[in-house]
């Protein structure tokens, strides 16, 4: 192998790996042909000048999870052929100026999870070839103007989880290659008009978990090729009516855990590839007519956790491939018995944790395909009769902790659930709150002669005899049915997977402890 | 008649853990939510927690999210407060309060007589 | 949300007319009840919903309003009214308090 330090492993394939906190200074001598190099968790505390000149055949240099604070300017002098240079996960305060200077292959650059306080455009001059540029995990309070004025071949660039408290709008002003920007997790207010005008082949802008309160009407005007764009837990209060109207590509939008109040109609469009879109943990009060009607493609919308007390009879136009709706944990008193008139594909609805206390009986009347409904923790004491009867495919349905009313016109209820007990599953079956004789008694087996009658009598006798099973054989008890979108908030898929934070919280679409142990 | 009895408070250093429990009797436990509500020395009223009748739905206020978990044994007629990464400003005369009814609402008909949660090292 | 109650503090005399107010900082129906709490005692509901008295509470007590702006009235103050008087939002998560309102006796 040409000689192999003790330190490391040489493997045929011209790899090297040193790794150890015996480590102290970069091991010698290393093997001429080596064309990749990994230091891995050792003690080194400093680079000296060309430790690696008699390497120059290396393309991929590792330098992670070390002691490293400080690099002498010509530590990387003769590797004219590096493609790959890590530096991440070190204690690196500085960068010298020139340092990457002759590296004129480089084509990945990470400096993640240091403690960079600053980049100036001398820095990265040098580099023109660089596609990837990694500064996330720093300490970085701003950007100079020029920074990145050199890497016109940049395609993603990364500035998440810094001190960033403004960006200067001409920062990214050469960058017309970029795909991927993230800006998440920085100090931002607002960013200026113009920021990202010379992005045109953008396909990623990652700006969540910032103090962002106000969007220019034109941010992201010139960025056709958007297809993911994460706005999530910023301080967003309101929507400019064109802030989203030329990003025909965007298949994913986060805007969860802001303050908006309100959403205007057409707001989000036109958008035919979007197929998620999550608004939870807002201020919504109200849904307006025709609120989503741009979106023709969306499957699952996400509403839960806002304070919606009214949604008007057309909110939900368009939606014709929606397959899951979240209501859960607002403020629903009544629902208007056409709001879901436009639903045929929805499968699962949550309006559990609302105030509901009645519903009409044409509310899932168009919507033949629901398969789970959770109305659990609202305020019903009744349901009109034959309101499930036509859901064939109805294996989930949530009536529990709801004040019901156990007398005489209870019982077409209590009939239809006797026959369609594994619907209910076995964890909580609805108990009578009233009156207060059969109070904690199962609705499903309650004696009604002892309940007090009803001052008027139902005209039709109960619902029909025979249960509507679903065509599978067997039915969840604690499971849910719904997909595995209910039990997480989207993750935003990133390529380097420390910026990678799933939330696996089960309330945001619906799951509660009694469905999801 | 209705009664509710809290006990497990005490002194506890910062960072410390302590669980309360409310032993609930005269009613029909596992059709009401129930709530706790404290009230630091000299201070307003304080909404900590509510808990529906099954169990199925728990709510938080935020300074609690993550530290304090409430549940309730429906069998034992017993709600509780687990507390856990207790910090100074947490001292208060804690309540356990029954609802007026089994979806959770923040009409509190009963309150039990309170105990004190004091957290200083 | 924000309660916030006015006054923070009143003096009157049994026999007078009382009306506290509870502002809230955004719409919220009429999700709202009012609590009388004395010193050393837990509190006690006296009004649900804005508007719906208690049962077992005395008619003096009368609350209403809706949306951002709510009332609690004693029509006639009697010497068992003389407390700290709470409102309680329970429309969004987190449930808020206002601050009080303490009634003493005007010397």
């Known amino acids: 192998y040409h000689g192999c330090p003790s330190e490391c492993t040489c493997s045929r394939a011209s790899q090297v790996e040193c790794t150890g906190a015996r480590i102290v200074a970069v091991p010698t001598p290393l093997p001429w042909n080596a064309m990749s190099l990994q230091i891995l968790n050792t003690h080194i505390t400093e680079l000296n000048e060309s430790p690696f000149l008699n390497i120059s055949a290396l393309i991929a240099l590792r330098i992670e999870k070390n002691e490293l604070s400080r690099i002498t300017p010509g530590a990387f002098r003769n590797l004219g052929s590096l493609r790959y240079l890590s530096l991440a996960n070190n204690k690196l305060q500085v960068l010298p100026i020139g340092l990457f200077q002759g590296l004129d292959s480089l084509e990945s650059l990470l400096l993640s999870s240091n403690q960079l306080l600053q980049i100036q455009p001398a820095h990265f001059s040098q580099c023109s070839n660089l596609k990837e540029l990694q500064l996330h995990g720093n300490h970085l309070e701003y950007i100079p103007d020029g920074a990145f004025d050199h890497l016109v071949g940049l395609t993603k660039l990364n500035l998440g989880k810094n001190s960033l408290t403004h960006i200067s709008p001409r920062v990214f002003q050469h960058l017309g290659n970029l795909q991927v920007l993230r800006l998440y997790e920085n100090r931002l207010t607002d960013i200026p008009m113009g920021t990202f005008d010379g992005l045109v082949n953008l396909q990623e802008l990652a700006l969540q978990q910032n103090q962002i309160g106000l969007l220019s009407p034109g941010l992201f005007h010139n960025n056709h090729n958007l297809q993911r764009l994460y706005l999530s837990n910023n301080h967003i209060s309101q929507l400019p009516p064109s802030v989203f109207m030329q990003l025909p590509q965007l298949n994913r939008l986060t805007l969860f855990g802001n303050s908006l109040k309100e959403l205007s109609p057409g707001i989000f469009g036109p958008m035919p590839n979007l197929r998620e879109l999550w608004l939870y943990d807002n201020h919504i009060s109200s849904l307006p007519d025709n609120v989503f009607s741009n979106l023709r493609q969306l499957q699952v919308l996400i509403l839960s956790r806002n304070q919606i007390s009214f949604i008007s009879p057309g909110a939900f136009n368009g939606l014709t491939e929606l397959r899951e709706l979240s209501l859960h944990t607002n403020a629903l008193q009544d629902l208007d018995g056409n709001v879901f008139r436009m639903l045929a594909n929805l499968q699962n609805i949550s309006l559990q944790n609302n105030r509901l206390r009645q519903l009409p009986g044409n509310i899932f009347a168009n919507v033949n395909g629901l398969m789970a409904i959770q109305l659990q923790n609202n305020q019903l004491e009744n349901l009109p009769l034959g309101i499930f009867d036509h859901l064939g495919k109805l294996c989930e349905l949530r009536l529990y902790d709801n004040p019901w009313r156990c007398d005489s016109d209870i019982l077409p209820l209590r009939n239809w659930l006797l026959l369609n007990q594994p619907r209910l599953g076995t964890d909580t079956v609805p108990v009578c709150f009233s009156p207060a004789n059969v109070r904690g008694q199962s609705l499903i087996i309650i004696n009604v002669n002892v309940a007090v009658p009803s001052v008027h009598v139902p005209e039709v006798p109960s619902y029909p005899e025979t249960p509507w099973y679903p065509d599978t054989p067997s039915y969840p008890d604690t499971t849910s049915v719904s997909s595995t979108t209910e039990l997480t908030s989207p993750v935003e898929d990133y390529t380097d997977l420390t910026t990678i934070q799933v939330t696996d919280d089960r309330s945001v679409w619906g799951m509660t402890q009694a469905q999801s142990g | 008649q209705v009664q509710l009895l809290e006990s497990g408070g005490g002194l506890v250093q910062p960072g410390g853990s302590l669980r309360l429990s409310c032993a609930a009797s005269?009613?029909?436990?596992?059709?009401?939510?129930m709530s706790w509500v404290r009230q630091a020395p000299g201070k307003g009223l304080d909404w900590v927690s509510v808990?529906?009748?099954?169990?199925?739905?728990?709510f938080y206020t935020d300074s609690v999210k993550g530290r304090f978990t409430i549940s309730r044994d429906n069998s034992e007629n017993t709600l509780y407060l687990e507390m856990n990464s207790l910090r100074a400003e947490d001292t208060a005369v804690y309540f356990c309060?029954?609802?007026?009814?089994?979806?959770?609402?923040?009409?509190?008909?009963?309150w039990g007589q309170g105990t004190l949660v004091t957290v200083s090292s | 949300i924000v309660l916030t109650q006015s006054p923070s503090s009143l003096s009157a005399s049994v026999g007078d007319r009382v009306t506290i107010t509870c502002r809230t900082s955004?719409?919220?129906?009429?999700?709202l009840g009012w609590y009388q709490q004395k010193p050393g005692k837990a509190p006690k509901l006296l009004i649900y919903?804005?508007?719906s008295l208690q049962s077992g509470v005395p008619s003096r007590f009368s609350g209403s309003g809706s949306g951002t702006d709510f009332t609690l009235t004693i029509s006639s103050l009697q010497p068992e009214d003389f407390a700290t008087y709470y409102c309680?939002?329970?429309?969004?998560?987190?449930?808020?308090f206002g601050q009080g309102t303490k009634v003493a006796i005007k010397r």
């Open positions: 005269g009613f029909t436990f596992s059709t009401f939510a």
């Open positions: 808990i529906s009748g099954t169990g199925g739905s728990t």
């Open positions: 309680l939002q329970d429309n969004n998560y987190p449930w808020t």
């Open positions: 309060a029954k609802a007026v009814t089994v979806n959770t609402r923040g009409f509190f008909d009963y």
């Open positions: 919903d804005a508007s």
């Open positions: 955004q719409v919220i129906r009429n999700d």
